[in-house]
Interface confidence: medium
């Protein structure tokens, strides 16, 4: 989960395993102020999961969320 310092959530680790795409409801990018670039996926369980934006599955999921 992202760590929130003040109002800026940042990620210090990424989920290693691909999530099933249907688990993901929405996403957002963490701030450029964070030391690690990250995508935060909001899941059907309302968890916020940090993911590595360089991973292919992460990019694919973002594309599919944008199109839907």
């Amino acid at each position: 989960s992202p760590y929130s310092s003040d109002t800026t959530p940042c990620c210090f680790a990424y989920i290693a395993r691909p999530l099933p795409r249907a688990h993901i409801k929405e996403y957002f990018y963490t701030s450029g102020k964070c030391s690690n670039p990250a995508v935060v996926f909001v899941t059907r369980k309302n968890r916020q999961v940090c993911a590595n934006p360089e991973k292919k599955w992460v990019r694919e999921y973002i594309n599919s969320l944008e199109m839907s």
Epitope: A16, R21, A22, T43, R47, K56, W57
Partner: antibody
């Protein structure tokens, strides 16, 4: 090269249990989602179980709930599927399948399968 | 639980086009995956997310999803394409993966 290497064929009596293993080589188990799928002789593929990456909880198809147990040993990069109270209907090839994320959430890696025969 | 319906068999002559269909309630927005299983072998992913060909799969294989039916199309069919084919989707209501009932492709 990434591979899923499964344990050998098993013959079990009705009522017994079986534990099938699936060792990941060339990749870390912690970066894969492993699923278990079975195929009875002459029949289609039947999804059984996987571990939810969100919270590490095993999810089972209704049919296998309470009778199947999926576990993982990250120290040996091995996943296991144990099935209890076996009947002849459980005679099948049991496959482990992996999701690397290179093709979204599709099962892009498969083991060769383990034949489990249940016979008295 | 969610059901995917496939025709049990499709026959085609070499060099022709084979279309293998997969029907399900409201497939729109779902990523349909397709697997090929040759006799005595483990399944192999051929198409993911409706239309993305898997690594090493020839361009002759393509996929589409109309929202009610997903289709795997094999153009210029070869004898080596003879196999069972399965579609697959995630059923979010049950949190389970579902496979279609398989289509046996016979190359005449």
């Amino acid at each position: 090269q990434v591979q899923l290497v499964q344990s050998g064929a098993e013959v079990k009596k009705p009522g017994a249990s079986v534990k099938v293993s699936c060792k990941v080589s060339g990749y870390a188990l912690s970066e894969l989602s492993i699923h278990w799928v079975r195929q009875a002789p002459g029949k289609g593929l039947e999804w059984m179980s996987y571990i939810d990456p969100e919270d590490g909880e095993p999810i089972y198809a209704q049919k296998f709930q309470g009778r199947a147990t999926m576990t993982e040993d990250s120290s040996t990069d091995t996943a296991y599927m144990e099935m209890g109270s076996l009947t002849s209907d459980d005679t099948a090839v049991y496959y482990c399948a992996g999701v690397t994320g290179s093709t979204s959430d599709a099962f892009d890696l498969w083991g060769r399968g383990t034949l489990v025969t249940v016979s008295s | 639980s969610y059901v995917l319906t496939q025709d049990p068999s499709v026959s085609v002559a070499p060099g022709q086009t084979a279309r293998i269909t997969c029907g399900g309630a409201n497939l729109w927005g779902l990523g349909v995956h397709w697997y090929q299983q040759k006799s005595g072998q483990a399944p192999v992913l051929v198409v993911s997310d409706n239309s993305d060909r898997a690594s090493g799969i020839p361009e002759r294989f393509s996929g589409s999803n109309s929202g009610t039916t997903a289709t795997l199309t094999l153009s210029r069919v070869e004898v080596g394409d003879e196999a069972d084919y399965y579609c697959q989707v995630w059923d979010s209501s049950s949190d389970h993966w579902v496979f279609g009932g398989r289509t046996k492709l016979t190359v005449l």
